[in-house]
Each structure stands twice: as C-alpha cells, then as structure tokens.
C-alpha cells in the first residue's frame, strides 16, 4: 500500500484546513491508527491528534477543540483531519504516520500554508495645487502573507514607487503615486488595486483627486457696446472664472463706491435703468483659498442725444 497526501495545503486565515492522509491499501489491509504531528525543522515533533480505529479521535491538549475528523461518511482507510480556524502560527510541516495491518507503518509529510489576506489602506498626500512640481498624490499600504501586490488604476499621468518591509510572518507593501498637479486632474479617480492569493477578487480603494487652482477672471456683458445707453433696463455684468475650491466673487468700483441701485448677486452685477452715473471702472475680484484674481472693465453709458460713439475698454489683471 501507499499513502496519499498533498505536498502543500493552502488555507486562508480563519478557515478550516483539511490535512489529507489516505492509505491506499491492498485488499484485506486495515488501518489501526493514524498519528498526526507537527514536525517543523529544528523542533521536536508536537503531537496533534491520534485517530484510532477503535478508540476514535484523541486530540492533544495543545490542539483541544481545534482538530476534528471530517464529517461522515468516513472511509476506515482515511486518516485525514480538519484543523479548525487556521492561524498564522499553524503554518509549517505536518506528518501523518499510519499504522496498518499487516503491512506495517507508513508516513508522509505535507506543508500547511496559511494565507493572510491584506487589509489595504490608502492615505492621500498633501493638498495638491496647480503649479506644484512632482507631488505625492496618495500612498497605499497592504500587509499580508505572502506579500500582496499593490498597483494603481487611473487615467491620470503619474509615476509610482514601491517598497516592502518583511516581518516575521508577513510582509507590508507600500506604493506611492506621484504626479504634477493640473486642473484637468480635478475629480479624477485614483484607485489602489491590491492583489493576493487569499483574496477572491482584487481589493480596490478609490481616492478622488482634488487639485486647487483658480482660472483667470474675465467680465462678460459689454460685448455689444450699443446696448449701454441711458434708460436701458436689465443691464448686467457677469464675472467669469472657475476654481477649486469654488471661488467667491466681490464687485467694487475703482473710481468710487458702487452707484445706488446697483445689485451685487455673487458673480453678477445688476444695474437699474442706466444713467450717466453708472459710467466708471468696475472691478471683479475672484478668490479662493488657493489664489485671487481681478478683472476690470470700463463702462461708458452713452446719451443717445449725443453723436459721439461709445467706447469700452476691457482690462484684465492678475
């Protein structure tokens, strides 16, 4: 006869490990007992359990409550056992020693591998601002056994660097993603992908990029100069900009206070029926936590009675 077992049994942390040991005997041969022991190199054998044909299963005190026979039906030639709730410390070499009649004793060894799936974490880097050089966008760390694989999934252009730290029974892998911040990256997903044999599928953690910026400001509303004449109703100026975080707007008049009746509504400056008093230089001030921008326009309200043409100057300043 001969023993059938596995060279390696792989199990995920917390799962039950089946340690196989089957005696493939000739007709009429019987198994008297199967002794299981842990036999790591450099250490004496530590008995796990004894499976006796008459007495049943005896579990050594160190493994009490953790070793069981597989559920019935059971073949009398099957000396396999279940090691419940595998932990990392269970990883190592195991031996089954089968006493048969009349063929004598047989033994076989197997290695138990306990996979420790990682629990990845993603840490964003410092605040990203347009105009910075190469900057850390995020780092992703995963620790497991064996060492996990950490990669990035993103449309954003950048560079990655990885390092690993070996511990006694596991390894921690950290990958960093660096980029040159630009406003086009704002809102883009940056996903850390962790692969490991103990995972049914890759673990993914997504970080949404936030890049602080403030666009140049401009003022709209003076495109048709002929519309700015005395008596016109509904005239308005709109300040155009964009930024992250979203900017706030403030209107002032360079050559004096805002005329009475002029309404400020965020990025819009609304005028009452136009008079010559509304002529002047208006400044839109745009700001967020990252920067501030100004844009100024000259409003010249025309009197239709006069022949002179209307003039409008637009000036932008940063």
């Amino acid at each position: 006869g001969e023993l059938e077992t596995s060279d390696v049994v792989t199990v995920v942390l917390g799962q039950d490990a089946k340690l196989p040991c089957f005696y493939r005997g000739d007709s009429g041969e019987q198994v008297g007992q199967v002794a299981w022991a842990r036999v790591d190199a450099g250490e004496g054998a530590q008995e796990l359990a004894l499976l006796h044909s008459k007495y049943g299963l005896h579990v050594s005190p160190a493994y009490e409550g953790r070793v069981e026979q597989p559920p019935p039906p059971r073949n009398p030639l099957d000396g396999s056992v279940l090691l419940r709730n595998a932990v990392q410390a269970d990883e190592g070499e195991y031996e089954c020693r089968v006493s048969t009649f009349p063929a004598g004793s047989f033994q076989a060894r197997l290695r138990l591998r306990v996979l420790v799936p990682p629990l990845p974490s993603l840490n964003p880097g410092p605040a990203l601002e347009e105009g910075q050089g190469l900057t850390l966008a995020a780092s992703c760390t995963a620790e497991g056994s064996p060492a996990p694989s950490v990669t990035w999934d993103t449309e954003v252009k950048g560079t990655t660097s990885s390092r690993s730290f070996k511990h006694s029974r596991s390894a921690a892998v950290t990958s960093e993603f660096h980029l040159v911040p630009s406003r086009s990256m704002n809102g883009q997903p940056l996903t850390c992908v962790v692969s490991h044999p103990g995972l049914l599928q890759d673990q993914r953690i997504t970080h949404i990029l936030h890049v602080s910026f403030l666009a140049e400001a401009s003022v709209r509303g003076l495109e048709d100069q002929n519309l700015w004449h005395i008596g016109r109703e509904g005239a308005m100026l709109k300040c155009l900009s964009e930024g992250q975080p979203p900017p706030s707007y403030n209107w002032t008049r360079l050559d004096g206070p805002l005329p009475s009746g002029v309404r400020v509504d965020g990025d819009t400056l609304g005028f009452p029926p136009l008079t010559t008093e509304h002529s002047g230089i208006y400044v839109c001030h745009v700001s967020n936590e990252f920067s501030s921008r100004d844009s100024q326009v000259t409003v010249d309200v025309l009197d239709p009675q006069e022949d002179s043409g209307k003039q409008v100057d637009l000036v932008s300043a940063s």
């Epitope: 004894l50 006796h52 008459k54 007495y55 049943g56 299963l57 005896h58 005190p61």
Partner: antibody
Framework: EVQLVESGGGLVQPGGSLRLSCAAS????????MSWVRQAPGKGLEWVSR????????SYADSVKGRFTISRDNSKNTLYLQMNSLRAEDTAVYYC???????????????WGQGTLVTVSS | DIQMTQSPSSLSASVGDRVTITCRAS??????LAWYQQKPGKAPKLLIY???SLQSGVPSRFSGSGSGTDFTLTISSLQPEDFATYYC?????????FGQGTKVEIK
C-alpha cells in the same frame, strides 16, 4: 499466562516510607507501560502513577506528586513504587496493572495484580 | 481533570434481568473508555475497552456503547457470578479517572 504479583505493603507510621514491588511474568515486560492504582478501604479506584517502557515517561496523580516515585527494572521484570512522607489518606490496597499501549493516554489496564495493603497509622 | 459520573451507585436485580449502567464524562473523550468488574477482595478485571469492544474471554452478555460523553454498560441476562461492583474509566487524558462505581446486588 500473564501474572503480576505485588509485595512490600505493610503498616507504616505517618511520615514514613515504603517501597512496593510488582514482579511480572508471562509476557515481554519491557514492551508494556505499567500503572499503579490504589483503592482505599470501602472506596473506589484511584490511579496513582504510570511509567512507559523506558524509565523516562512517568506521570503521577496530584495527590502523590513529589512524594511517590515510580520506576522499573526491565532486566528484572519488576515495577516499583517508592512512597515517602506517607499520610493516613494513603492507606489503601495498591494494585499494579499492565497497560495495553505504551503511551500517556489511550490505554486500558488489561491485567492486574492481586494487590498489597498499605496501612499508614500511628 | 475529567470527572466520570456513574449511575446508579447501586442496584438490586435478579438472575436473568437485563441490567444497564451509565457513565457520563465531564468532557468529550471519544471512545477512550473502559469498563471493569471487581468482586470483593479481588483485583479489577477488564470487561470492555474502547467503549464497545469486548475483552477476550469476557462473556458476550456484556456489551458497551456510547461515544463522546455518554456511555452504557449492559448485561443482557444477569448471571450469579455477575454480582459485583462495576467501574468505568476514561484514559483520554492524564490523569486517567474512574467513576465512583456501581454495586450490583442480588434482589
């Protein structure tokens, strides 16, 4: 025919010592582990000590640990129990018995001697 | 230590009766259980090993059953020579422990 014969019992004062012997015959003595079991007058059975086939595998009941020593001489087919610091509660018939397996669990006691009485009294 | 509890502690029966003695272990012991018979002034005698296996030379009217924590010794038809005290013993752990005994007396 397997035979186990105990000797060495008797009356001893508290604090005294006795050495019990068990002569084995009718089987290969050095192939079997051995045990001592005692029975106080009118009481049940209590396991005392065990020795495996070699002199190193020894176990004791908590009640005798540190006072009793089990040993064997395979060349003489004899099992011993050295009893020191004897107490009144050690009064019992002491039986030697053969184990069916040479290990520290999973054995039966298939042959017993006739017993020897140890009385501890002043 | 594993406690072994036998019941009843004594019973009276007549020749030909079916007698059942139970033994309960304080924790699971698989089938690591033996039954012994002891007559007054004599050494115990092994009747049943591995909970249900009959020792060589023991009459077939003796039988054992059970596994784990609950065990039974049955004498199918009590004979005059069966009046004695019966002990169960576990040898799953050290120290091996005995039940307190069941005395079978003549009714």
């Amino acid at each position: 025919e397997v035979q186990l014969v105990e000797s060495g019992g008797g009356l001893v004062q508290p604090g005294g010592s006795l050495r019990l012997s068990c002569a084995a015959s009718g089987y290969t003595f050095d192939s079997y582990a051995m045990s001592w079991v005692r029975q106080a007058p009118g009481k049940g059975l209590e396991w005392v000590s065990r020795i495996k086939t070699t002199d190193d595998g020894k176990s004791y009941a908590d009640s005798v640990k540190g006072r009793f020593t089990i040993s064997r001489d395979n060349s003489k087919n004899t099992l011993y129990l050295q009893m020191n610091s004897l107490r009144a509660e050690d009064t019992a018939v002491y039986y030697c018995a053969r184990q069916t397996e040479d290990r520290s669990y999973g054995y039966d006691l298939d042959y017993w001697g006739q017993g020897t009485l140890v009385t501890v009294s002043s | 230590d594993i406690q072994m509890t036998q019941s009843p502690s004594s019973l009276s029966a007549s020749v030909g009766d079916r007698v059942t003695i139970t033994c309960r272990a304080s924790q699971g012991i698989s089938s690591y259980l033996a039954w012994y018979q002891q007559k007054p002034g004599k050494a115990p005698k092994l009747l049943i090993y591995a909970a249900s296996s009959l020792q060589s030379g023991v009459p077939s009217r003796f039988s054992g059953s059970g596994s784990g924590t609950d065990f039974t010794l049955t004498i199918s038809s009590l004979q005059p020579e069966d009046f004695a005290t019966y002990y169960c013993q576990q040898h799953y752990t050290t120290p091996p422990t005995f039940g307190q005994g069941t005395k079978v007396e003549i009714k």
